[in-house]
Interface confidence: medium
């Protein structure tokens, strides 16, 4: 699927408000950069079910961001 070879936001639209915790394999946070001027929270789902964007303003996203920042700093 040769699509989207360029630097830009990865999330199309605001994103889902929540993802079932049991379905989450991994959460990645993309901070604002030259490629994209907003924070993006990308959830990788278990069982090769792809990825979803989580709305960074949602309660779940804020908790994930907090958790990741605590871990990293």
């Amino acid at each position: 699927f040769p699509m989207f070879k360029r630097g830009r936001c990865l999330c199309i639209g605001p994103g889902v408000k929540a993802v079932k915790v049991a379905d989450i394999e991994k959460a990645s946070i993309m901070y604002p950069s030259n490629n994209c001027d907003k924070i993006e929270v990308i959830i990788t789902l278990k069982e090769n079910k792809g990825q979803r964007c989580l709305n960074p303003k949602s309660k779940q996203a804020r908790l994930i961001i907090k958790k990741v920042e605590r871990k990293n700093f």
Epitope: M3, C11, I12, P14, G50, R52
Partner: nanobody, 129 residues
Amino acid sequence: EVQLVESGGGLVQAGGSLRLSCAASGFTFDDYAMCWFRQAPGKEREGVSCISSSDGSTYYADSVKGRFTISSDNAKNTVYLHMNSLKPEDTAVYYCAAAQGVVAGASLVWVPLDEYDYWGQGTQVTVSS
């Protein structure tokens, strides 16, 4: 009731143009990525283009880049696909779909097709040589 209604398909000669429309109702347009897919006979459904209604960002498959343009009219809750320089290989049924949380990765199918929230019934586009 949620509805996505496509229109604008038809028969056109190679090199010609068409404009597809997708009228959405029954959900909050701005919360969704609005995408066009197509399915040719005997082939898998493939992503063509997406637009974020909230900020206007647009995304295209390599096969249509420079020829197709996606746009939306938020006041009318309608998404358009302007198709120029059409080729016989563009012949397919074109579907409009809406999903939340679409990631523009290697393809528009990062979100599995069955997880797209809403689908239209499709409109046939036939390009003759």
